[in-house]
Interface confidence: low
C-alpha cells in the first residue's frame, strides 16, 4: 500500500486496550444527498427487472434505516410487458459498512459492521445446464 | 423515533468541543465476506445490461478501495446478442457510508462521508418526450 | 397437431380448491418454461404463475399462498392448485408454453360463487 506521514496534529486517540478504536466524526460531509431511493430515479418500475424497494429500520444501527430491493418476478419482463421465463431477475448485491451501537444502546460507542445490501435488480441469462 | 434506555457500561467518549464524535472499533463483524465484486457472481457478464468494475483506491478513505460499475452499452442485449438501442442500459447507484480521514493522513481521526457509487447496471425503457 | 389443452376448470364455493391441468400435445413441454394467465371479463390478461424448465416457481401477489404451480415432465403436463378461492379469482384460466408468441391452449373457465 501507500505509506503516507501521519499527521503531527493529530489527536491521540489510542486506548492501549483497544487497540483498533478510533475516533469519528458523525457530522457526514455530503449529508444533503438523497436517501429515499424511490424519489433519486424511477429505475425500479422501468427496468425490465423491477423490483420493490423494502423500508429496513434498525435503532441499533448507523445509519437506521436501509432500503433493500426485492425483485418482482423470476422472470424479465419482455417487449410486450409480459414475463419472460427464459430470462431471470436477480438482486444485485454490494457490500457496505454500517455503525452497529456496541455495547447495546450506547449513544457514543460502535463496532464497524459489514451488511450484504440488494440495491436493485437486473436481468440475465439463466445459467442452462446442459444433460449428457 | 425509537427511545431506548443508555446503557450504562457506555464508555464516556463525549468531547465538549466536538460533540458528534463517537468511539468506533475497526474491527470490523463479518469481515469474511467477499470484497471483490468480481468473485461474487458473473451477473456483470450475464446482464443484459453488462458492466465492467473500476477499481477505485483512496488511501484517505476508509475502504480505500471501492469497485464501480460503468454500464458497458448505451442499448441492451436482446435475445440475438446484438445491442438493442431501444432500452437503455443504465447504472444503479447506492450511497454509501465511507470513513475518510480528518485531519488528512491521521491514523485514528475520521468523519463520516456519504458518496454515491453505482453497484451495477439493469435494462431501462427509455421514457419518450412526446413532441406537442 | 401441436396444441395445448387446459381442464380442472369449474364452478365452486369461495374458499373451495379446484385443480387445472395442462398437456402438451405433439411437442415436448420439458424444454419450455410454462405459465398459467388469467383474463376475466374486460380486464387484460395477467400472468398467475410461471414455472421454470428448472423448476423455479413464481405467483402474482394476489394468489401467493393461495396458489401451487408444478410440472410433471414424463406427463408432458403442468398443474396449478388453486386453495381458497375467491370471487376475484373468477376467469378464464390460460396455459402458455415459451415467449409469449409460443404455445397458447384455448383456456378453462373457473367461476367463483355463491
Known amino acids: 500500500g501507500i505509506t503516507i506521514p501521519r499527521n503531527p496534529g493529530c489527536p491521540n486517540s489510542e486506548d492501549k486496550n483497544f487497540p483498533r478504536t478510533v475516533m469519528v466524526n458523525l457530522n457526514i460531509h455530503n449529508r444533503n444527498t438523497n436517501t429515499n431511493p424511490k424519489r433519486s430515479s424511477d429505475y425500479y418500475n422501468r427496468s425490465t427487472s423491477p423490483w420493490n424497494l423494502h423500508r429496513n429500520e434498525d435503532p441499533e444501527r448507523y445509519p437506521s434505516v436501509i432500503w433493500e430491493a426485492k425483485c418482482r418476478h423470476l422472470g424479465c419482463i419482455n417487449a410486450d410487458g409480459n414475463v419472460d421465463y427464459h430470462m431471470n431477475s436477480v438482486p444485485i448485491q454490494q457490500e457496505i459498512l454500517v455503525l452497529r451501537r456496541e455495547p447495546p444502546h450506547c449513544p457514543n460507542s460502535f463496532r464497524l459492521e459489514k451488511i450484504l445490501v440488494s440495491v436493485g435488480c437486473t436481468c440475465v441469462t439463466p445459467i442452462v445446464h446442459h444433460v449428457a | 423515533g425509537i427511545t431506548i434506555p443508555r446503557n450504562p457500561g457506555c464508555p464516556n467518549s463525549e468531547d465538549k468541543n466536538f460533540p458528534r464524535t463517537v468511539m468506533v472499533n475497526l474491527n470490523i463483524h463479518n469481515r469474511n465476506t467477499n470484497t471483490n465484486p468480481k468473485r461474487s457472481s458473473d451477473y456483470y457478464n450475464r446482464s443484459t445490461s453488462p458492466w465492467n468494475l473500476h477499481r477505485n483506491e483512496d488511501p484517505e478513505r476508509y475502504p480505500s478501495v471501492i469497485w464501480e460499475a460503468k454500464c458497458r452499452h448505451l442499448g441492451c442485449i436482446n435475445a440475438d446478442g446484438n445491442v438493442d438501442y431501444h432500452m437503455n442500459s443504465v447504472p444503479i447507484q447506492q450511497e454509501i457510508l465511507v470513513l475518510r480521514r480528518e485531519p488528512p493522513h491521521c491514523p485514528n481521526s475520521f468523519r463520516l462521508e456519504k458518496i454515491l457509487v453505482s453497484v451495477g447496471c439493469t435494462c431501462v425503457t427509455p421514457i419518450v418526450h412526446h413532441v406537442a | 397437431e401441436v396444441q395445448l389443452v387446459e381442464s380442472g376448470g369449474g364452478l365452486v364455493q369461495p374458499g373451495g380448491s379446484l385443480r387445472l391441468s395442462c398437456v402438451a400435445w405433439?411437442?415436448?413441454?420439458?424444454?419450455?418454461?410454462v405459465n398459467w394467465y388469467r383474463q376475466a371479463p374486460g380486464k387484460e390478461r395477467e400472468l398467475v404463475a410461471g414455472?421454470?424448465?428448472?423448476?423455479?416457481?413464481d405467483y402474482a401477489d394476489s394468489v401467493k399462498g393461495r396458489f401451487t404451480i408444478s410440472r410433471d415432465n414424463a406427463k408432458n403436463a403442468v398443474y396449478l392448485r388453486m386453495n381458497m378461492l375467491k370471487p376475484e379469482d373468477t376467469a378464464v384460466y390460460y396455459c402458455?408454453?415459451?415467449?409469449?408468441?409460443?404455445?397458447w391452449g384455448q383456456g378453462t373457465q373457473v367461476a367463483v360463487s355463491t
Open positions: 402458455n408454453a415459451g415467449r409469449e408468441n409460443g404455445y
Open positions: 405433439g411437442f415436448s413441454f420439458s424444454i419450455y418454461s
Open positions: 414455472i421454470t424448465k428448472g423448476g423455479l416457481k
